[in-house]
């Protein structure tokens, strides 16, 4: 297993609709043609897998049907979008990139993107 640098933004604020997007960029040491991207959430020293996708370079990322993530790739960048976020989902979202093929295998883990989610205030009842 060889190490690889992965960069991602330090902070992202989710939209009022609970959507957060960020770019995960990896420094590919070789000519990787198959890449696996995993988003991990770290909160209260617990790490859980949010979503993951394996894709062939130049093809679209396909997440599982029940995934809260979508994404696109361009070169060594993956544009990730996480949907359905609520205030309780605030936390550090870490991008893990694995170069699966061809060998050798490379692994890179970003420092994480702190995603802040603020639940929208309920609309006040109208008197009109």
């Amino acid at each position: 297993c060889k190490a690889m640098h992965v960069a991602q933004p330090a902070v992202v604020l989710a939209s009022s609709r609970g959507i957060a997007s960020f770019v995960c960029e990896y420094a590919s040491p070789g000519k990787a043609t198959e890449v696996r991207v995993t988003v991990l959430r770290q909160a209260d020293s617990q790490v859980t897998e949010v979503c993951a996708a394996t894709y062939m370079m130049g093809n679209e990322l396909t997440f599982l049907d029940d995934s809260i993530c979508t994404g696109t790739s361009s070169g060594n960048q993956v544009n990730l979008t996480i949907q359905g976020l609520r205030a309780m989902d605030t936390g550090l979202y870490i991008c893990k990139v694995e170069l699966m093929y061809p060998p050798p295998y490379y692994l890179g883990i970003g420092n994480g993107t702190q995603i802040y989610v603020i639940d929208p205030e309920p609309c006040p009842d109208s008197d009109f």
């Epitope: 043609t33 995993t38 396909t62 995934s67 061809p102």
Partner: antibody, heavy 118, light 107 residues
Framework: LVQSGAEVKKPGASVKVSCEAS????????IHWLRQAPGQGLEWMGI????????TYAQKFQGRITMTRDTSTNTLYMELSSLRSEDTAIYYC??????????????WGQGTTVTVSS | SIVMTQSPSSLSASVGDRVTITCRAS??????LNWYQQKPGKAPKLLIY???SLQSGVPPRFSGSGSGTEFTLTISSLQPEDFATYYC?????????FGQGTKVDIK
């Protein structure tokens, strides 16, 4: 994926099996070659990237296996040389698909029986 | 390479039986495990991917579970067309490797 017909070869000879792909974008999916000896399990032989033609072979077959592709006809080839009786098997091409993080062999050729006998 | 070990290597069962096949990996493969069914003279057919996701068109009597190093394929009520050989395959790392197979035949 449609494969070529059965072959009978003598020890020391070579065999070239074809696999014609249709119904999808040829360059978007890796093709793997696997084989199955009579009454045995599945053995992975190697992989070809139809986009650039790059290959990786199982160590066991290094030096006597060659995988190629023809993008004009969307056909893949697997050639095995210096055949011996232990190479008697059904040879399969299979397309590797990925959904979420996991990849799998969703589409297979019908198999090509290769018999090596003197 | 990761070594996959299936048990049992064969089993006899009757129509309507609940059948469980186990697959163990020599190291953790997370949930990157697939199951295939193969009938004599035919190519393998994908049943389950990512340990528990049912491939389109596969009857819901087939289910998969497990993560890490231990996985199971369950057929809730065996049907006549289910008598076949079943293989697990790890997709965690390169190269892909298969279990030796479990043959399910009629009791």
């Amino acid at each position: 994926l449609v494969q070529s017909g059965a072959e009978v070869k003598k020890p020391g000879a070579s065999v070239k099996v074809s696999c014609e792909a249709s119904g999808y974008t040829f360059t978007n999916y890796y093709i793997h070659w696997l084989r199955q000896a009579p009454g045995q399990g599945l053995e992975w032989m190697g992989i070809i990237n139809p986009s650039g033609g790059s290959t990786t072979y199982a160590q066991k077959f290094q030096g006597r296996i060659t995988m190629t592709r023809d993008t004009s006809t969307n056909t893949l080839y697997m050639e095995l040389s210096s055949l011996r009786s232990e190479d008697t098997a059904i040879y399969y091409c299979a397309r590797r698909d990925c959904r979420g993080p996991s990849c799998y062999f969703a589409y297979w050729g019908q198999g090509t029986t290769v018999t090596v006998s003197s | 390479s990761i070594v996959m070990t299936q048990s049992p290597s064969s089993l006899s069962a009757s129509v309507g039986d609940r059948v469980t096949i186990t697959c163990r990996a020599s190291q953790s493969i997370s949930s990157y495990l697939n199951w295939y069914q193969q009938k004599p003279g035919k190519a393998p057919k994908l049943l389950i991917y990512a340990a528990s996701s049912l491939q389109s068109g596969v009857p819901p009597r087939f289910s998969g579970s497990g993560s890490g190093t231990e996985f199971t394929l369950t057929i809730s009520s065996l049907q006549p067309e289910d008598f076949a050989t079943y293989y697990c395959q790890q997709a965690n790392s390169f190269p892909p490797t298969f279990g030796q197979g479990t043959k399910v035949d009629i009791k």
